[in-house]
C-alpha cells in the first residue's frame, strides 16, 4: 500500500455512485480520528476486489448503509 | 460533460513567480482529488503534485518542493498551482487532471479528465 | 523510488496489426495502481486503463491490460488509424507519488 506517515486521510477522492449491496465483499468505516478528521467509508467490490472511496453525505451511501446495516440485523440471531 | 480548463501561463523570467489555475465543470469538483502534470518540449509525462478532495493531504514531486504550491477552492471550482523561484527546467505544458471518483491509497482509478494543458516558459 | 522503463521505444506497425507494449518497474507494484495513458500530437493525454487490466470509461476493447508484480502489458488487438499515438504506463506508488514511464510511441510503418 503506497502509505507514508504523511498522509492523513485514505480517501483520494469519494464517489456518490450507489453500490449495489449484492456486489460488495465488504463495507468498512473508519471513524474520525487524530489521523484523519472525517468519516471514511471504503467500499470492497467482489470484482477483482476493487476499493472504492464512497461519499458519507451522499443519499445513495446513506440508502447503502441502511440496507447493509438492515441485512446485517437479519443475519445476527 | 466533465471539463478542465487551465490558464495563468506565460513567459516569465528565472527566480520569478506565477500563478496557474484550472477551472472545473461537468463534475462535483470538491469530490475528487487534483493533479498537476507537466510536459517539457518534446519529452514525457512528469507528474507534480496532488491535492486531496477536501485539501487533507498534498504531496509533490521532489524537484518542486518548498518551491510549489497546490491548492484548491471547492466553492469556485477552481485548482491553483503557485510556483516561485521558476527555473529554466520548469518550462513546460502544464495540465490538470482529475483523480478518479472513489480513489484511495488502497486502489488507484488513474487520471481520468485532462485539460488541455497551459504553457509557461521561463526564459531570461 | 521505484522507476519504470517502456519498451520497444518506438514500435512501427500497420494498421490491422496487433501491438504489444511493455512496462517494467523496477521493483514489485501491486496492479491496482498501474495504469496507461494514450497521448496524440498537440493533445492532452487520455486514461485508458487503471488497475492493470480495468478499462476506463469508453474506452474500446481492443485495448487490454495485463500483468503483475514487474511486468505489464498494453494489448492493442488490432490497431485502428486512430491509435497511432504515444502511450504511457504510470504508477502510484509511497510517499504518495505518481510515476509515469518515459512512453512508447507507436507509429504507421
Known amino acids: 500500500v503506497p502509505l507514508s506517515r504523511t498522509v492523513r486521510c485514505t480517501c483520494i477522492s469519494i464517489s456518490n455512485q450507489p453500490v449495489n449491496p449484492r456486489s460488495l465483499e465488504k463495507l468498512e468505516i473508519i471513524p474520525a480520528s487524530q489521523f484523519c478528521p472525517r468519516v471514511e467509508i471504503i467500499a470492497t467490490m467482489k470484482k477483482k476486489g476493487e476499493k472504492r472511496c464512497l461519499n458519507p453525505e451522499s443519499k445513495a451511501i446513506k440508502n447503502l448503509l441502511k440496507a447493509v446495516s438492515k441485512e446485517r440485523s437479519k443475519r445476527s440471531p | 460533460q466533465m471539463q478542465l480548463v487551465e490558464s495563468g501561463g506565460g513567459v516569465v523570467q528565472p527566480g520569478r513567480s506565477l500563478r496557474l489555475s484550472c477551472t472545473a465543470s461537468g463534475f462535483t469538483f470538491s469530490n475528487n482529488g487534483m493533479h498537476w502534470v507537466r510536459q517539457a518540449p518534446g519529452k514525457g509525462l512528469e507528474w507534480v503534485a496532488v491535492i486531496w478532495f477536501d485539501g487533507m493531504n498534498k504531496f509533490y514531486v521532489d524537484s518542486v518542493k518548498g518551491r510549489f504550491t497546490i491548492s484548491r477552492d471547492n466553492s469556485k471550482n477552481t485548482l491553483y498551482l503557485e510556483m516561485n523561484s521558476l527555473r529554466a527546467e520548469d518550462t513546460a505544458i502544464y495540465y490538470c487532471?482529475?483523480?478518479?471518483?472513489?480513489?484511495?491509497?488502497?486502489?488507484?482509478?488513474?487520471?481520468?479528465?485532462w485539460g488541455q494543458g497551459t504553457t509557461v516558459t521561463v526564459s531570461g | 523510488e521505484i522507476v519504470l522503463t517502456q519498451s520497444p521505444g518506438t514500435l512501427s506497425l500497420s494498421p490491422g496489426e496487433r501491438a504489444t507494449l511493455s512496462c517494467r518497474a523496477s521493483q514489485s507494484v501491486s496492479s491496482s495502481y498501474l495504469a496507461w495513458y494514450q497521448q496524440k500530437p498537440g493533445q492532452a493525454p487520455r486514461l485508458l486503463i487503471y488497475g492493470a487490466s480495468s478499462r476506463a470509461t469508453g474506452i474500446p476493447d481492443r485495448f487490454s491490460g495485463s500483468g503483475s508484480g514487474t511486468d505489464f502489458t498494453l494489448t492493442i488487438s488490432r490497431l485502428e488509424p486512430e491509435d497511432f499515438a504515444v502511450y504511457y504506463c504510470q504508477q502510484y506508488g509511497s510517499s504518495p507519488i505518481f510515476t509515469f514511464g518515459p512512453g512508447t510511441k507507436v507509429d504507421i510503418k
Open positions: 487532471a482529475r483523480e478518479g471518483d472513489g480513489s484511495g491509497i488502497y486502489y488507484y482509478y488513474g487520471m481520468d479528465v
